[in-house]
């Protein structure tokens, strides 16, 4: 309704003597700002005066505030929105109705708020979930309809009068909707908490008791059981009797059914609190427990381990592992069902007792072929000795032994021969299935363990074979000792170290890489002519005529090998120089005369120089000197000089005669 002032605040506020009240409040006036505010206690409207009567706890006018009693009551609001109030301390006689008389310029309003002040601090209220089950987390809530800024309080949880370890979360609300203090505690109750008292205690800031609330926990849980057995150690011999009793120590709600379990499986027709076992057998050994159920679920007792003792049963042997590899470790395990466990063992290998072996396990750290055979054992405990079982077979596997490579050929072997070898061995487990040969080659294996080398190479030095089952055993290599003609025969210049110049002392060496047999002979030849029979060919003073193609031969009892032809090159200065003339040494003036410097040189002439009859050098650098047109005064002796990297050579003089042409003679 638009003619009303709008207020928001809690309907009733609760406190106790000496505490305080904080009243959260908001409003909206009909018009303009608040001009006057009076707080009444139990106001009553006086029709005669058209005013409200009652105790004025607080008053505020245009002129300013009227001091209240020691400022016990405070208006914390403003002129348009906030109407929050505080009373501190609050007294029992403050209970009743508070009236907020508000006046603006043209409008008036009376807003009523209930105040409930008790003589003593009122108790908080504990809220529990509808059902509590063991081990399921629940939240306990303690609520107090009180909160005031000027009066701090705390809520503490106690279980059977002892503070609870779990951390509680306390929250406070001081809003226009609600005023309260709340503590929440998360808690996982156990079956043992059933029937226990939980208290929420209200305390002041110093921890002084103010009030409390208590509840008794109703924790739903499965039956809690205890099992008793006769005899108490649950150890009996075959034929004895055993009694087990099941007692319920707690159940909420009451139990409904009883059953017995052996090794987790339910025993049929056993639905009472007592289990009687008569003339037990060893098969009845095991873990027993009783199970009692209620609406929450089944509860189980602790397990009782019933041991029915008996003498060892016939034993079996387990081998880790068979077949075993020679050199590996092997463990034998004697397995025999017995209770109590066997205290002594007797071991047999191929029916013969193994001395000093009395343990359940026999460990052989390094297996050898003679360890193969049948292993059996006998177990013994306080009740007797068992029987020897069938035993277990140990198979010891090993690589082929004493492998040898044997040459079948008559010796010596020559390069190109066909060689046959066989691979022999002494023993093997498992059997030999294949053979290997080293080095690898494109060789023939006509039968298992036989190798045929066609056209044996000079460098087939050694051959080794391996006999293989799961492993390969290699024989020591055998030397074929192949005999062959000298190899890699070549001519090598020993001196001079650099190029050969005419007049040098020259030594050539006939080298070869290998020969078998070692004894060799040498032969030197040039152009099919025998020059010497030493490993070296020597020239005291080499001449250009010694240049040419040289070969050396090396032979032994197997054959002979020739080197590649080696070219001997002799470097020499230009020699045998001569000047040739074209078309001849007599030429008519006006024609062309070509002079050519001919020579023998190694390396070839790199530079030519021409000279006239007065040894004057002519400006030509080529092998040919061309005079065109030639003149009569060019008649004379000419010579040339040739130069290469070794030196110089000069020609003898050659005379050119230039004669007059008929025209010249005619003019004279």
């Amino acid at each position: 309704d638009s003619s009303k002032w709008v207020f928001e605040h809690p309907e009733t506020l609760y406190a106790w003597e000496g505490a305080c009240v904080w009243i959260p409040c908001t409003y909206r006036a009909l018009d303009g700002d608040l001009e006057s505010f009076i707080l009444f206690h139990n106001p009553e409207y006086n029709k005669n005066t058209s005013k409200f009567d009652g105790t004025r706890l607080y008053e505020s006018t245009k002129d300013g505030k009227v001091p209240s009693e020691q400022k016990r009551v405070q208006f914390l609001g403003d002129k348009n929105k906030n109407c929050t109030l505080s009373i501190h301390p609050v007294h029992l006689n403050d209970s009743g109705q508070l009236g907020l008389r508000m006046e603006s310029k043209t409008e008036k309003w009376m807003e009523r708020i209930h105040l409930n002040v008790s003589e003593r601090p009122f108790p908080p209220h504990i809220q529990l979930p509808p059902e509590i089950q063991e081990s399921q987390e629940v939240t306990l809530t303690c609520l107090l309809n009180f909160s005031c800024y000027g009066y701090p309080i705390q809520l503490q949880w106690l279980l059977e009068g002892v503070p609870m370890r779990q951390a509680a979360v306390t929250s406070t609300s001081l809003t226009i909707k609600s005023v309260f203090t709340r503590s929440e505690l998360k808690f996982s109750p156990q079956w043992s908490h059933h029937g226990k008292i939980v208290t929420c205690q209200l305390q002041d800031a110093d921890g002084k008791f103010l009030s409390n609330d208590t509840v008794q926990l109703n924790v739903k849980h499965t039956p809690k059981l205890e099992i008793k057995v006769t005899p108490s150690d649950a150890i009996v011999r075959e034929g004895d009797s055993v009694t087990m009793t099941c007692e319920v120590s707690s159940s909420n709600p009451e139990y409904t059914t009883v059953s017995w379990l052996k090794d987790g499986t339910s025993l049929k027709k056993q639905n009472t609190f007592t289990l009687n076992l008569r003339e037990v057998t060893k098969d009845q050994s095991g873990k027993y427990c009783c199970q009692v159920s209620n609406d929450v679920g089944p509860g189980r007792s602790e397990e009782v381990f019933l041991q029915v003792q008996y003498a060892p049963e016939p034993s079996t042997v387990q081998i880790l592992h068979s077949p075993a590899v020679e050199g590996s470790q092997v463990e034998f395990l004697c397995m025999s069902l017995a209770n109590p466990l066997p205290t002594n063992y007797t071991w047999y290998h191929n029916g013969k007792e193994m001395q000093g072996r009395t343990e359940e396990k026999v460990h052989i750290p390094k297996i050898l072929p003679w360890h193969a055979g049948t292993y059996s054992c006998v177990a013994e405990n306080i009740l007797g000795t068992g029987q020897r079982g069938p035993g277990a077979e140990l198979d010891v596997q090993y690589p082929p032994k004493k492998v040898t490579t044997v040459i079948q050929n008559p010796m010596p072997i020559r390069e190109g021969d066909t060689v046959t070898l066989s691979c022999n061995y002494n023993s093997s487990n498992p059997s030999v299935t294949r053979y290997e040969w080293k080095p690898h080659g494109a060789w023939e294996e006509p039968s298992l363990g036989v190798l045929k080398i066609q056209n044996v190479g000079w460098d087939n030095t050694t051959i080794a074979c391996a006999a293989c089952n799961s492993w390969c055993s290699w024989a020591s290599p055998v030397a074929l000792n192949v005999q062959y003609a000298p190899r890699d025969v070549r001519v090598r210049k020993i001196k001079p170290l650099s190029e050969i110049h005419s007049g040098n002392s020259v030594s050539l060496q006939c080298d070869f890489s290998s020969s078998h047999p070692k004894e060799v002979q040498f032969f030197w030849e040039k152009n099919g002519r025998l020059l010497g029979k030493e490993s070296q060919l020597n020239f005291d003073s080499i001449s250009p005529e010694d240049a040419g193609s040289y070969s050396c031969w090396v032979n032994n009892s197997i054959g002979q090998t020739a080197s590649k032809a080696w070219t001997l090159e002799v470097l020499y200065a230009p020699r045998r120089l001569r000047v040739s003339m074209s078309p001849g040494d007599q030429v008519m003036e006006g024609k062309s005369a070509t002079l050519t410097c001919e020579s023998d040189a190694n390396p070839p002439v790199s530079h030519y120089t021409w000279f006239d009859w007065n040894n004057q050098s002519l400006p030509y650098h080529s092998q040919k000197l061309r005079l065109e047109p030639v003149k009569v005064q060019h008649s004379g002796a000419y010579w040339c000089q040739g130069t290469n990297s070794v030196g110089k050579g000069r020609s003898p003089l050659s005379t050119l005669t230039v004669y007059y042409s008929p025209e010249t003679i005619g003019r004279r």
């Epitope: 530079h607 006239d612 007065n614 050098s617 002519l618 400006p619 650098h621 061309r626 005079l627 005064q633």
Partner: antibody
């Protein structure tokens, strides 16, 4: 300092004879380590060696195959000069003509380069 | 007798190096160590810069150097200067009756 001074007409009619002279100062034509050369330059043919003369025990001359038969080099030792005669000229013979020396000895070793040049004469063959 | 082959043009900035090649045959460049290099400014006579492959006449800057490999000769100008802008010609003695052959010429531009 060796200098070569060229002289001769700049315009020659086709089929006539081109005649140029090169006067030498600072060196003798009779030197037995020099040769005396004629070279021409034209946009179409570039630099082209035409011929040379030199004196050792007598006078010698050499000519390029491209002009051999219509070229001659004459010497006047009294004036220490040499000349080029090129007969039967055509417009193809238009270009700048240079005389140049080659000194063949550089210390004890042989050498061969045009180390001194004349100033050049622009010759145009045109009717 | 064919002329020796040179690149038509070459260029470089001041301070840089430039190399000009001259390719002939075994009858000229490859056969003799008588290769020479000439510098020619417009309207002027050629000037000898390098003779006998790698020798420098007195008065020529040591920025100019020559070399030869097989049938190809080279002229290298280091630390280029503006005054190096000119035409460059190579020449070689030859075994033919035309005793000397020249290169086609290279125009060198100095980029300023």
């Amino acid at each position: 300092e060796v200098q070569l001074q060229q002289s001769g007409p700049g315009l020659v009619k086709p089929s006539q004879t081109l005649s140029l002279t090169c006067a030498i100062s600072g060196d003798s034509m009779l030197s037995n380590s020099d040769t005396w050369n004629w070279i021409r330059q034209s946009p179409s043919r570039g630099l082209e060696w035409l011929g040379r003369t030199y004196h050792r025990s007598t006078w010698y001359d050499d000519y390029a195959s491209s002009v051999r038969g219509r070229v001659s080099i004459n010497v006047d030792t009294s004036k220490n000069q040499y000349s080029l005669q090129l007969n039967a000229v055509t417009p193809e013979d238009t270009g700048v003509y240079y005389c140049a020396r080659v000194r063949l000895q550089d210390g004890n070793s042989w050498s061969d380069a045009f180390d001194v040049w004349g100033q050049g004469t622009m010759v145009t063959v045109s009717s | 007798q064919s002329a020796l082959t040179q690149p038509a043009s070459a260029s470089g900035s001041p301070g840089q190096s430039v190399t000009i090649s001259c390719t002939g045959t075994s009858s000229d460049v490859g056969g003799y160590n008588y290769v020479s290099w000439y510098q020619q400014h417009p309207g002027k006579a050629p000037k000898l810069m390098i003779y006998d492959v790698s020798n420098r006449p007195s008065g020529v800057s040591n920025r100019f150097s020559g070399s030869k490999s097989g049938n190809t000769a080279s002229l290298t100008i280091s630390g280029l200067q503006a005054e190096d802008e000119a035409d460059y010609y190579c020449s070689s003695y030859t075994s033919s009756s035309t005793l000397y052959v020249f290169g086609t010429g290279t125009q060198l531009t100095v980029l300023l």
